[in-house]
Structure formats: C-alpha cells, structure tokens
C-alpha cells in the first residue's frame, strides 16, 4: 500500500532532500530554510538562494522548513505545576517539566500535570519515581496500598479489596482473642 501524501508532501517529493518545489513554478527546486529561520521569499530561479530570515523573539523553527511564519514558543502551564526546563530559542521550543521529586501525569497526549512522588511511608520503594510514573510502593505487614499510600489495616472495611491483604492480620487478632478465652 502506498501511503497517502498531502499536496505539500507530494510537491516536496519531486525535489531532492533539503529542497522544495517553487509554489509558482514547479520546474524550480528551492533550498529549504535552516532551523531557526523561516521563508521570507522563494528563490527567484534554479541555483539561486532562498530568502530566509531569522525567527523573531518568542518564535522558533526546530527543523529545516519553508514556513511563511515561525511557530510561537509554548508557555509552561503554571496551573499544572509545570516549570521551565529550558527557555525557547530560535531553533528550539520551550522545554517544560516538573520539579525534583515530582512526576508527570498526562491528561492528554501533550498536556501533563506535575504530582509529588510518593514517599512510601509505612512501606518500601519497589520501583523508584520516574519522569512519567509515580513511585511503586510495597507496604509493610499490617498496612495495605490505597491510592499508592500505605494505610493501616485498621482502616480496612470488609467490603474493600484490602480484606485479602489484611486477612492474616485479622486472623491473628481472632487467634489471640480465642487463646485468651481457654
């Protein structure tokens, strides 16, 4: 199966790599603009230079292109707890991330919120906190995992999943009560 090509890709594929077809004259291949620049004017003829201009402050292009405008730098989402890892330059967009001891939770493919890594109190770290995943905790005896926190089995209600994990604890309590009555 031949992948479907858009009009722009079709036009570009006629020219060698690093060049694009002139929009008004399909017999001319113009050199693409370097990253950090954008297309101001197409090349006037074969072998002649494309007029590329540097992106203005607050905009960028991250790869060779024939864009008429640079792309706007993205802003880190403060309300999501994001911080700026590196600021925008003419050839690279802003890089946003989370603070130390935080991880990313993605609400969509490209929108994330920062959350604090779990400390595994009353348990041990099974897997360390990663960029996109919280710490995985293993709880000590007498505790069960609820929303990635180790909670005392005394808070385990019969209807909850924790009954299986806390059962030995409950049995032990029963056992000591029984032995006390004989």
């Amino acid at each position: 199966l031949v992948p479907h090509l858009g009009d722009r890709e079709k036009r570009d594929s006629v020219c060698p790599q690093g060049k694009y077809i002139h929009p008004q004259n399909n017999s001319i291949c113009c050199t693409k603009c370097h990253k950090g620049t954008y297309l101001y004017n197409d090349c006037p003829g074969p072998g002649q230079d494309t007029d590329c201009r540097e992106c203005e402050s607050g905009s960028f292009t991250a790869s060779e292109n024939h864009l008429r405008h640079c792309l706007s730098c993205s802003k880190c989402r403060k309300e999501m707890g994001q911080v700026e890892i590196s600021s925008c330059t003419v050839d690279r967009d802003t890089v946003c991330g989370c603070r130390k001891n935080q991880y990313r939770h993605y609400w969509s493919e490209n929108l994330f919120q920062c959350f604090n890594c779990s400390l595994c109190l009353n348990g041990t770290v099974h897997l360390s906190c990663q960029e996109k995943q919280n710490t995985v905790c293993t709880c000590h005896a007498g505790f069960f995992l609820r929303e990635n926190e180790c909670v005392s089995c005394s808070n385990c209600k019969k209807s909850l999943e924790c009954t299986k994990l806390c059962l030995p604890q409950i049995e032990n309590v029963k056992g000591t009560e029984d032995s006390g009555t004989t």
Partner: nanobody, 124 residues
Framework: EVQLLESGGGLVQPGGSLRLSCAAS????????MYWVRQAPGKGLEWVSA????????YYADSVKGRFTISRDNSKNTLYLQMNSLRAEDTAVYYC?????????????????WGQGTLVTVSS
C-alpha cells in the same frame, strides 16, 4: 453509544453547596479520565476539574481550588462534583465530559463527548 447525563444543578444562595452527578453509559467508564467543564452566561468554556480513571490524580482550575471536589464511583459509573462556598461567578451550565483533545502544547482543548449540561445559579 456514549451517554453522559448530568443532574444536581439548581438555584443556591452565595456560600451554599451543591453536588453534581454525571451518569455515564456506553463505554468502559472505569478506564477513562473524566472532566467537568462550565460555561457562564455570555462567556467561553472553562475547564473546571479532572479526575483520572482510578481517582488518584485530580486537577482543579485556580478559580475553584479549595472549594470544589471531584470524585467518581466506578462501580456506579458516576462522576461527582461537590461544590462548596459557591459564589455568583460560579453561575454557569456545568458539563460532564470525556475524551480530552489538546493542541500541540495543550493551549486549546476540546472533548470527544459531552452531556447536555446542568444549570447552576448562585444568587441571593
């Protein structure tokens, strides 16, 4: 067919409380992030709150932080929004939504599915 049905809206005095519910059907509710969005009269849409599939991660807009609480009951396929200390500026139609779509850097948002909305009016 995905269906989202909100309820619980009404007229409430400033400082009062309301609890909105959203009954979901037609998809595996327990496997999806869910959202509350609102539209005030004559204004654009505002993303109010979000909760992940397990109920472990939540998001609140600054305008509602500390006053609203989002929760879900996966056994009942229901999403909730507990709204306390209500203000006149909370007056809006509240929608339950699923399937967040964002532009490249998350500046523009949209949703795949919406409910019909429930009107919340905060007035004395």
């Amino acid at each position: 067919e995905v269906q989202l049905l909100e309820s619980g809206g009404g007229l409430v005095q400033p400082g009062g409380s309301l609890r909105l519910s959203c009954a979901a059907s037609g998809f595996t509710f327990s496997g999806y992030n869910m959202y509350w969005v609102r539209q005030a009269p004559g204004k654009g849409l505002e993303w109010v709150s979000a909760i992940d599939a397990y109920g472990t991660h939540t998001y609140y807009a600054d305008s509602v932080k500390g006053r609203f609480t989002i929760s879900r009951d996966n056994s009942k396929n229901t999403l909730y929004l507990q709204m306390n200390s209500l203000r006149a500026e909370d007056t809006a139609v509240y929608y339950c939504a699923e399937g967040l779509q964002t532009s490249d850097h998350g500046e523009r948002i949209s949703f795949d599915y919406w409910g019909q909305g429930t009107l919340v009016t905060v007035s004395s």
